[in-house]
Structures are given as C-alpha cells and as structure tokens.
C-alpha cells in the first residue's frame, strides 16, 4: 500500500575536521521510493556538485573534504508523492586546528617606542595565543600584553625585550608555532665619556678620550675647528657595544675639539657630540720659539727630486736656512757618488726630501717628516750595505761636517703612515729601467724572478726611481 | 670603507681554468699593492702573487709561476687570478689583500684589508 | 727562498698569561715583517706591520720585536678574544714567505 515518507533517522550535528570526510544520514521509510534533496543553509545542492557524493537513494550526504567554509545547517527532505514532503536538519559543524594565518615578522625598533608583533590566527574551537621569548614563556605586565587578536604589544621598548620571539596557537584540537622572529632594539648613540679640555705647552702630546655607546654601535668621529681633524693618530676600540676613541694630538695650535658618534637607523641617523677646548699656555711664545717658515724650493742640488713648485721648511736655527740647508744636501749627495746605482737614486730622493722637509703652512709652520715605511725601503732595500756605513761613520764622527749628521735620519723615530697619512711625507715613486739594475740588495740570496716593465727615464721635475726588483 | 669582495670560485677538474676576481672598493687598485694568498683546508696561509698595478709589475710564488696570472683593471678597481693547468694541491680558500703604497715600500705597511676569500676546489 | 720558521706551533695559556711566539728568518732579512691574527673561517687580521709598529685599533697588550733574524710577538696579558691562530709573515724583495702558524689554545 502507498505509504507516505517517515524520516526514521533524523539528522545530527557533524563535527568534522578540515580536509576529512562529513556525513550525514537521512534514512526513510516510504512507498513507492521518495525522492531526496538536500539543501545547505537552505540552498539546494546540485547532484552533479563534485565536492558531494549522494548514495543510498540519496539518503547519505557524504562531503568528501570539508572547507571551514562548509559548516551550516545542512537539511534533507523525502517526498513521494503520497502525503506531505517531510524534512530533517542537522548542522556541520567545522573544527580546525589552530592555523597561524598572520605569522610574526623580524622587527627592528627603537628604544622608548611601541613595538606590535603580529600573530593572527583561525582554528575552531578559536585558538589561544600565547608567546615565548627565547625558552621561556613570556609573561605579560604593564608594558607586554596580548591583544585580543593575537598580537603582541611592547611599549616603550627597553634593551632587555630585544631577542628571538614566537607565538604559539593552541585549541583542544592541536597547537601551531609560528617561525622564530627577531626583536632588534636600536639605541640613539649617547656619548658615556666626553673629551677633556686641556691647557697645555706648545709642542706637547694631548690625547683626547671620548667614549660612547648605542645600538648598533656608533662611529666616532673628531672634528678641529669645524673641520675634519686632519693631523694626529686615532686609536679605536670596541667592547661591549662601547667604543672608545682616543685623538693623540702633537699641539702647535689652540682649537675646539668634537667628538661625534653617530650611529644609524634605518635610513635616519642619530649623533651625539661632546667638545674639548685645547688653550695653548703663553700662546704669543711660539712666534718668538717658531724654528722655521715655508718656502719654495730655490736650490739646485734638489731640483730633480723635489715636486716643481714645493713648498719645503727652512730652519731658522741657521743664520741663512736656505744656503745652509742647501749646503747640508750639497755635501751628502758628494758622500752619494761612490754608492751603487741602486742606492743612489734612492738615497737622493730621501736625503732631499729629510733636509727639505714638506712644509705645512699655518699660524705655526710645520715640517712633515718622512712617512718611516719609506725611510726603511731605502734603508733596507736600496742602500742595506751603504746604510751600515753611513752610520758607522756618524757614530764615529768621520764626516767632515757635523751638520752631516742630519742627513741620515733615523728611521725608527719618523711616523708610520699608518697612524695618520696626512702627518708624514711620501716618496716620491723609485722606479728604475732594466739597465740600472746590475746588483740586488743584499737582503735575499737568491736571485728572484722579475717582470720589469719597460719605464722611460726619469725626467727633470719629477723624479722616479725604484727598484723593479722589489715588490714590497 | 676600505672593501675587498672576491668571486669566480668553484668546483673545477684538474688541468681546468679559473679566474678569480677582486673588486676593490674605498681605496684605487693603481696606489697601493694587491696580493693573493691562499689557505688549504685545515693548513695554513701561502702567497700566491702580487701586482702593483701602478707599474703592472707582478711577482709569483714558485709553486704557481707559469701556471697562474694576476692582473688589474684599474678602471674597474679590481684586481684578478687566472689560474690555469690546476692540480689538486691548488684546493684552497683562496683571498685577496692589499698594502698601502707602491711595491718597494709596501710590505712595511703589512697586509691591512683582506677579503672573505672564496673556496676553489680542484677535484675529479 | 727565505724560510720563516714560528715557534711553536702550539700553545695552552689562561687568561692573563704572557704568550711569546717567534719567527727566525732563514737569513737576513728587511724589516718588513708583519703579524697576523686568523679566526676559523675568517680572514687574517693585521695586527703588527714593520716588525714593531702596532696597527691602528689593535690593543696594546700586543707587541712585536726584532732581535737580528729573530722576530718575536708577544701578548702581555691573554684575553678570551685572543685565542686563534697567529702567523708571522716577511716581505723581501719580491718573495712574500708567512711561517706556518702557531695555535693558542684555553688551557
């Protein structure tokens, strides 16, 4: 007999995870068979929908991998003709493992300022957000919170909070770490010691002292009246995100002193500065103690060597600088003639530029010394036999005159160019042609093998010798 | 800020080539002395070569001579090593540095900048 | 060539000991001799040029001295940042020779 449908299983709330299969069941009883449609939040689902599969008559309702998007009131409804359709509902209710959707990301920051470490998630049940810094939890207080949506807040970021961050998602159905991030806390550079003003003697040695800190670590630089400190040794060190700098000044003049450390954030910098004042006392005294004054080269002897046009120190400490001076190269270059050829070009090029010293222009003139790296190539490369004579007899006074004694200065006492490449004079390049070199110094017994360039002579202004046997 | 960045090294066969190069930044290749040396795995440092390009005068260790060139570009500020006919022993790290002034006087300033160095291997 | 021959090639010191390492030249030699300071899997670092000189940067507790063909390094009180590798180098005339290298290790 015709029966009218009777939905004898009614439908239940699924819960189903992410990715895995739902069903729902609708079993019916009825005559002649009813037909069966099922709906999702009351919109019909299609049969030839591929994400579905309808069995049994239609009576199971299989979804064959849930999205979190399928949860709803899913209701399936029999109608056969005989009586009124009947329908039956159930929800779907979508878990999902806690899923970081907005993970953390590196943040560079600076002290004082208010740092956000996003952490946004999806999972169902809604996952809990916590964090950990380094190994431990991170605990939350007046300055760190949590927001509600995951997110971490620090205000006024301190030193301390800087280090490796990740936040952790956790609900009843599993927990999802996020990447370790880095928290960078930048500090503005601040200067921890700042330079002591000095009064001082002309000619003394001042060292200025200038510490400072910052993250990153500053630089330090000095500035001299205004402009880049152009003379003196800088010594540098850096311990424990301190720099120390200390200036060796050689003072021959008062001047305001500044240290300046910078340090850089992003594309913005931030300084700090501390000055120094350095009084001369009796300041009018080196005008009456002043040893010398620039001129230019007038002589003879020195032409070849010295730059055209150089402006060289004449020493006040003889009655005529200029001829005395000229006389003192005049006689070592006659002591010259009975050296190698090797030497000689060499030794000229030292001997005028040690008895006409470069001379610096200022209030006090100062003559610029030899760099020592120089002074020991020719020494020890160029003249290593005719050296060692050289100062026998000065130590043993043969040489006729006493202002002999000048001529061969002593290497060790001239400042090295690396401690500060204005404060000493170059060389002018030694370079000689394959013909000029008939012996090697003594200083390597066997004979090395050489690419030497063919090099023109060297011509009148700018004299150019050196040892094509000598790379270093 | 004195920078020396050395590339071109790699995986190559004995009796293959290489060219290594140094580019130099923060001083001119034409003033001071550029150099390379080289460091096995686990031994210590051997020169290989220098230039002072400011004459193109080259110097070379025995074991290398005849087998490796170094140049400079100074218009380009770098300097390089080709290195040909290589043998196994020539696996090493190798790295590029430079002295102040020219060559007579520049091996009393020492070696002050030094690159990362970069890894050539020499293996069948 | 010119052989430079360091001693030793390694050492055990604390903290606060004073460390010597030699170099002797094989002959006479310039004193273009330099001292460096190598990190595993770093570059050398300067540390003395012209046998004496102390490079810019380089604290004073080391120093460096000729005796003849005898070149000397000495670090007067050893810091924990000082353990590494040191080698000597010479610069002659156109042959460059480092010595083979002298390990300080923590006691």
């Known amino acids: 007999l015709p029966k009218a449908p009777v939905i004898t299983t009614p439908l239940e709330t699924v819960d189903a995870l992410v990715e895995e299969v739902a069903t729902f069941m609708c079993a019916v009883e009825s005559y002649p068979q009813p037909e069966i449609s099922w709906t999702r939040n009351k919109i019909l689902i299609k049969l030839f929908d591929t994400r579905y599969s309808i069995r049994e008559n239609g009576q199971l309702l299989t979804i064959l991998s849930v999205e979190d998007s399928d949860d709803g009131i899913y209701c399936c409804t029999a109608n056969n003709g005989v009586g009124g359709a009947v329908e039956s509902c159930g929800a779907l209710q979508v878990k999902m493992k806690p899923k970081i959707t907005r993970p953390p990301i590196n943040v560079k920051i600076i002290e004082g300022l208010k740092a956000v470490l996003p952490c946004t998630t999806m999972g169902n049940p809604k996952p809990s957000v916590s964090w950990i810094k380094g190994d431990s939890p991170l605990r939350e207080n007046s300055r760190i919170a949590v927001l509600e949506s995951g997110s971490l807040r620090i205000h006024n970021v301190q030193k301390e909070d800087a280090g490796q961050y990740r936040c952790v998602a956790k609900n009843s159905l599993g927990t999802a770490y996020s990447k370790v991030v880095k928290l960078e806390v930048e500090v503005f550079a601040r200067i921890l010691r700042a330079p002591e003003s000095h009064n001082v003697t002309f000619g003394s040695f001042v060292t200025l002292h200038c510490t400072a800190t910052g993250i990153p670590v500053p630089t330090i630089t000095w500035i001299e009246n205004g402009n880049a400190v152009s003379s003196g040794s800088i010594q540098e060190s850096v311990k424990d995100r301190v720099i120390d700098s200390r200036l060796q000044l050689f003072i021959t003049k008062p001047g305001l002193y500044t240290c300046i450390a910078t340090n850089k954030h992003g594309e913005k910098f931030s300084t700090a500065k501390a000055a120094a004042t350095i009084s001369i006392a009796e300041w009018s005294k080196p005008q009456k103690d002043n040893k010398g004054y620039c001129a230019q080269y007038r002589g003879e002897v020195c032409n070849a060597v010295l730059a055209k046009d150089a402006l060289v120190f004449l020493n006040t400490s003889y009655a005529d600088p200029e001829e005395a001076q000229e006389l003192l190269v005049h006689t070592a270059w006659n002591e010259l003639k009975v050296v190698s050829p090797v030497c000689r070009p060499a030794a000229e090029a030292l001997l005028c530029n040690h008895i006409f010293q470069e001379c610096s222009p200022g209030v006090v003139p100062t003559p610029i010394p030899i760099c020592r790296e120089y002074c020991l190539a020719v020494k020890e490369l160029f003249c290593a036999k005719e050296w060692l004579v050289m100062e026998e007899k000065t130590h043993r006074g043969l040489y006729r005159s006493e202002m002999h004694l000048l001529s061969v200065p002593e290497c060790s006492k001239l400042p090295s160019m690396h401690w500060d490449p204005t404060a000493c004079a170059r060389l002018p390049h030694l370079d000689y042609n394959k013909e000029n070199l008939k012996t090697f110094p003594p200083m390597t017994s066997s004979k090395p093998s050489v690419d030497i360039p063919n090099l023109p002579s060297s011509s009148s202004s700018s004299f150019s010798v050196s040892p094509t046997y000598s790379m270093t | 800020e004195v920078q020396l960045v050395e590339s071109g090294g790699g995986l190559v066969q004995p009796g293959g080539s290489l060219r290594l190069s140094c580019a130099a930044s923060g001083f001119t290749v034409s003033s001071s002395s550029i150099h390379w040396v080289r460091q096995a795995p686990g031994k210590g440092l051997e020169w290989v070569a220098s230039i002072s390009s400011s004459y193109g005068s080259t110097s070379y260790a025995d074991s290398v001579k005849g087998r490796f060139t170094i140049s400079a570009d100074t218009s380009k500020n770098t300097a390089y090593l080709q290195m040909n006919s290589l043998r196994a022993e020539d696996t090493a790290v190798y790295y590029c540095?430079?002295?102040?002034?020219?060559?007579?006087?520049?091996?009393?300033?020492?070696?002050?900048?030094w690159g990362q160095g970069t890894l050539v291997t020499v293996s069948s | 060539d010119i052989q430079m021959t360091q001693s030793p090639s390694s050492l055990s010191a604390s903290v606060g000991d004073r460390v010597t390492i030699t170099c002797r030249a094989s002959?006479?030699?310039?004193?273009?001799v330099a001292w460096y300071q190598q990190k595993p899997g770093k570059a050398p670092k300067l540390l003395i040029y012209s046998a004496s000189s102390l490079y810019s940067g380089v604290p004073s507790r080391f120093s460096g001295s000729r005796s003849g063909t005898d070149f000397t390094l000495t670090i007067s009180s050893l810091q924990p940042e000082d353990f590494a590798t040191y080698y000597c180098q010479q610069s002659g005339v156109w042959l460059i020779t480092f010595g083979q290298g002298t390990k300080v290790e923590i006691k």
């Open positions: 540095a430079r002295s102040e002034g020219d060559r007579y006087v520049s091996g009393y300033f020492g070696f002050d900048y």
């Open positions: 002959q006479s030699v310039s004193s273009a």
